[in-house]
Interface confidence: low
């Protein structure tokens, strides 16, 4: 009677172990008299010849599929060979692909590090991860690795990185996309510029001056505060750009330094001061505004 190769489990999943046992026929004496060797497709496995009738393959992969058998050699050099057993390693298709971000929430400060983490809930073997930007799908990076997650890193986030992203994972059963993730790049406000707009070249008491404050860079919404010296005159919000304005009816007391502040929750910036001077009225002459 020949040897018997016992494979456990007989239909392994990728990444899992397989135990091979070379079973002696019942008529043979103690296993201790034999040396054993396991083969796959004519290639010896593990340690080669050994006194152990068992061999564990810690991680089976798709490419380990093949024809396996074992041999036993007696002290007298007689070689016994088992029948060949076909082992087909089952690959688990990727499923449940998700794209997550660090920092979480998809909001990153300009200049900070952004990581797009593509994960699959299951899947074995070499998984190819692909990252795409925008609905049209500009391919950013491709990585192939034996892990359930992979990272795409943007070391320094810029305004142009604000987009929708998705990733795709596949391991031979067709691509599986994640959902779209929107990235917002949050930009601190730049130093605002304060402009004074008068209805005429030389404004007089009673005219309405428009103080206009605008930060040219910064994530919206931006809240603007208007100051006379260090006293807050009022505030105005700009939900979507263009700056904000504050109307001021001129009186002689309005002489002094004016400034504005922009704040979008990522930091505040104060403008340079603008000085407005009024002359004390005499006779019929007008009070003129000089800046």
């Amino acid at each position: 009677a020949g040897l018997l190769l016992i494979v456990s489990p007989s239909h392994p999943t990728e990444g899992s172990p397989v135990n091979l046992t070379c079973k002696m026929p019942s008529l043979q004496s103690s296993d201790a008299q034999f040396q054993f060797c396991f083969f796959r497709d004519d290639q010896a496995l593990g340690p080669g010849w050994s006194s152990s009738p068992k061999l564990q393959i810690a991680n089976m992969w798709k490419e380990d599929s093949g024809s396996y058998w074992c041999e036993a050699q007696t002290m007298a050099s007689k070689v016994l060979r088992s029948w060949r057993s076909q082992i087909n390693v089952h690959r688990v298709p990727v499923a449940d692909v998700s794209l997550e971000t660090q920092p979480p929430g998809g909001q990153v400060m300009e200049g900070d590090r952004l990581v797009l983490i593509c994960s699959v809930a299951m899947g074995t073997g070499d998984i190819t991860f692909l990252w795409y930007k925008g609905a049209i799908g500009l391919n950013l990076q491709t990585k192939t690795q034996r892990s359930l997650t992979a990272e795409y890193e943007i070391p320094t986030a810029r305004e142009s990185d604000a987009e929708q992203y998705y990733c795709v994972a596949e391991n031979g059963y067709g691509p599986r996309p994640s959902g779209l993730v929107s990235i917002t790049v949050r930009i601190p406000v730049s130093r605002p510029i304060l402009m004074v707009r008068a209805p005429r070249a030389q404004a007089v008491v009673g005219d309405v001056l428009k103080l206009h404050c605008e930060a040219l860079r910064g994530s919206h919404p931006i809240l603007y505060w208007f100051y006379h010296e260090d006293v807050i005159l009022g505030s105005s919000s700009a939900p979507s750009g263009g700056g904000a304005s504050f109307n001021l009816s001129l009186t002689a007391e309005h002489s002094g330094n004016y400034s504005c502040e922009a704040n979008n929750g990522l930091g505040a910036q104060r403008s340079e001061e603008v000085t407005l001077n009024f002359t004390v009225p005499t006779g019929a002459r007008s009070n003129h505004l000089t800046s």
Epitope: G15, N59, L99, E100, P104, G105, G106, Q145, R146, S147
Partner: antibody
């Protein structure tokens, strides 16, 4: 079952280096990031860094960038952390820990490092 | 870095009592895309390595008794032990993993 095996203790002299090991078993080593955590006697937990066993890419806590170096050996399913220029401040228990979905789900028993002349 | 603050630093309770401990983060740990909070709770018994109890702020790790419950969202989180057992004597740490991991300083649970 998942196991992370670490040596119990290391006694080292100031100014020298030590390489701590962490042997993983019971799971596919390359699929999960390995993190290292420091705990000084009677103190809390402090993250040192992490390594992706698949690519070998590592990230460090800024505080430990010049102190620790993380490596892996895929063939032996082992992770290593080398600590250099040791001082008494480095005397602590060092844990390796596997990370799954962000949380540290399996921990080694820790290696106690004592820096003493 | 995200700073994690735990309170109280220690508490002593009798067996069978209910215990709550707090963990606050310096910024939100809630990820809007999946509505998950990137927060875990660990138990460290004397002379042992830490053990994962709760992840995603409220998901109990396999094998953890159901007397342990995690709750909270955003920046405020709570670990509750519904009926303390003598074996629960330990230090409990919260940890965020929305960025490079940081731990709270721990809450030491003592049994009266």
């Amino acid at each position: 079952q998942v196991q992370l095996q670490q040596p119990g203790a290391e006694l080292v002299k100031p100014g020298t280096s030590v390489k701590l090991s962490c042997k993983a078993s019971g799971y596919t080593f390359t699929r999960y990031w390995m993190h290292w955590v420091k705990q000084r006697p009677g103190q809390g937990l402090e993250w040192i860094g992490r390594i992706d066993p698949n690519s070998g890419g590592s990230k460090y806590n800024e505080k430990f960038k010049s102190k620790a170096t993380l490596t892996v050996d895929k063939t032996s399913s082992s992770a290593y952390m080398q600590l250099n220029s040791l001082t008494s401040e480095d005397s602590a228990v060092y844990y390796c820990t596997r990370v799954n979905s962000g949380a540290m789900d399996y921990w080694g028993q820790g290696t106690s490092v004592t820096v003493s002349s | 870095d995200i700073v994690m603050s735990q309170s109280p630093s220690s508490l002593a309770v009798s067996v069978g009592e209910k215990v709550t401990m707090s963990c606050k983060s310096s910024q939100s740990l809630l990820y809007s895309s999946n509505q998950k909070n990137y927060l875990a709770w660990y138990q460290q018994k004397p002379g042992q390595s830490p053990k994962l109890l709760i992840y995603w702020a409220s998901t109990r790790e396999s094998g953890v008794p159901d007397r342990f419950t995690g709750s909270g969202s955003g920046t405020d989180f709570t670990l509750t032990i519904s009926s303390v057992k003598a074996e629960d004597l330990a230090i409990y740490y919260c940890q965020q993993y929305s960025n490079y991991p940081t731990f709270g300083s721990g809450t030491k649970l003592e049994i009266k």
